[in-house]
Amino acid sequence: SSPCPQAWGPPGVQYGQPGRSVKLCCPGVTAGDPVSWFRDGEPKLLQGPDSGLGHELVLAQADSTDEGTYICQTLDGALGGTVTLQLGYPPARPVVSCQAADYENFSCTWSPSQISGLPTRYLTSYRKKTVLGADSQRRSPSTGPWPCPQDPLGAARCVVHGAEFWSQYRINVTEVNPLGASTRLLDVSLQSILRPDPPQGLRVESVPGYPRRLRASWTYPASWPCQPHFLLKFRLQYRPAQHPAWSTVEPAGLEEVITDAVAGLPHAVRVSARDFLDAGTWSTWSPEAWGTPSTGTIPKEIPAWGQLHTQPEVEPQVDSPAPPRPSLQPHPRLLDHRDSVEQVAVLA
């Protein structure tokens, strides 16, 4: 059997660190057998059999010029084997980030904090932290560790399914290469990393007869499990076209009537979601939806009997993906925020 331990990585490759002494091992001989070493394709003897180093070649302070293929030969000239030297660095602790889009599952992504230049893999696991007292922790079989299953196709991500919302978890991501291993431990709680996906299906409609109103409605994100105990709250922003500043409201449910829209101008609307007890953070904003308030007009015929009534001028505008080009004419009621004059009323 070979005297050379096989490091993790492709066969026939041995590894070292730049600036450090590197030992290469001749794989096809018995431990201690004297061998001669050559660079592949070069006749010059690097180290003879009388070096006293047996089956090993020592390179002091290796650098990039030492990378490549080496050949070792036994005393009778037989090929002892070929070895490829690759230089790189031991792993540094990876950087890990975890996020949850719902209260039952979370995922963790990672990235190397330093590029080792060597073949690298990652081991991912987690355990549930059980806290006994003020500052004591106990490990029991029921708390893991369990593997954190990694995404296929090599994405640097693993997912924990069926997590407990009120529990703390310790994530272990270990970077492994032929020169060693380095572990990042990250403590996470679902409550702190919860960030829902943005609400879906945002629609913006005019309110017939009310030229300063818009009705926005939306639904829960599809990723949010349908259970009554974990609700979402929402934040809605709106602004007229060409206005830089957003107005913000916190609707009570899945709908909001905007009462101070600028008549005649298209408005952008977007919504964000958060756990209703303020766990975690707000979602990103939904894609903007656009709508224009209806323009009320005086009807052509006034009924014979005296009556106060309102009449819409246009059909509601739903969910248009891009804003209609607004008129560049200044609007006479741009700064009018009074709801009391909103209705277009005719008294017979």
């Epitope: 950087v95 992504t109 990672w110 990235s111 904090s113 590029i115 230049g117 990042r184 990250l186």
Partner: antibody
Framework: EVQLLESGGGLVQPGGSLRLSCAAS????????MTWVRQAPGKGLEWVSS????????QYADSVKGRFTISRDNSKNTLYLQMNSLRAEDTAVYYC???????????WGRGTLVTVSS | DIQMTQSPSSLSASVGDRVTITCQAS??????LNWYQQKPGKAPKLLIY???NLQTGVPSRFSGSGSGTDFTFTISSLQPEDIATYYC?????????FGPGTKVDIK
């Protein structure tokens, strides 16, 4: 020569923006995490933000989260810090620093002074 | 965040004296502690990494020890060029934090 050189500092009004750059030379920039650390006049060192070699993960101090954005261009060997909604308390010398790894800083630039004042 | 405290905040010593600075973390940081030297008007310089490892090119009179929450930095024989502020810094957490610093000058 192995070095880091910051630029982009200056005087800015509260609420304003500034973009700092850090040019790296003499080492394989794309192989290391990079960091911004700041030091207010007469005060200690405060970590601001770090970014991994591939640029896909970043971290920020709570004091700058949502206002500052760290980024890097490995093809230009340059680190950036976009600073928005600046406040008087952001006044400091801003240093860029190189790993090894994440959170150790074995190479520092000379720093660039950012003054936020009206 | 992990809080770092240092003591003393300043000290004066004679050339040749042994100088000791302590650093305490608010929670266990294993050995993930670095020491930096900053001279007036200059950028910080890494002296000791991971509690006890001397950075390449740093004189051997500087040393560090400790693990967990309590750490010590020592200058075995103070030299005039050692006048500076010394900072400890943890990197156990992905949000590194520095101690407030210890200013060292010559009596």
């Amino acid at each position: 020569e192995v070095q880091l050189l910051e630029s982009g500092g200056g005087l800015v009004q509260p609420g304003g923006s500034l973009r700092l750059s850090c040019a790296a030379s003499g080492f394989t920039f794309s192989g290391y995490s990079m960091t911004w650390v700041r030091q207010a006049p007469g005060k200690g060192l405060e970590w601001v933000s770090s970014i991994v070699p591939y640029g896909d993960l970043t971290q920020y101090a709570d004091s700058v989260k949502g206002r500052f954005t760290i980024s890097r261009d490995n093809s230009k060997n340059t680190l950036y810090l976009q600073m928005n909604s600046l406040r008087a308390e952001d006044t400091a010398v801003y240093y860029c620093a190189k790993g090894p790894g994440w959170g150790s800083f074995d190479l520092w630039g000379r720093g660039t002074l950012v003054t936020v004042s009206s | 965040d992990i809080q770092m405290t240092q003591s003393p905040s300043s000290l004066s010593a004679s050339v040749g004296d042994r100088v000791t600075i302590t650093c305490q973390a608010s929670q266990d940081i294993n050995n993930y502690l670095n020491w930096y030297q900053q001279k007036p008007g200059k950028a910080p310089k890494l002296l000791i990494y991971d509690a006890s490892n001397l950075q390449t090119g740093v004189p051997s009179r500087f040393s560090g020890s400790g693990s967990g929450t309590d750490f010590t930095f020592t200058i075995s024989s103070l030299q005039p060029e050692d006048i500076a502020t010394y900072y400890c810094q943890q990197h156990e957490s992905q949000s590194p934090t520095f101690g407030p610093g210890t200013k060292v000058d010559i009596k």
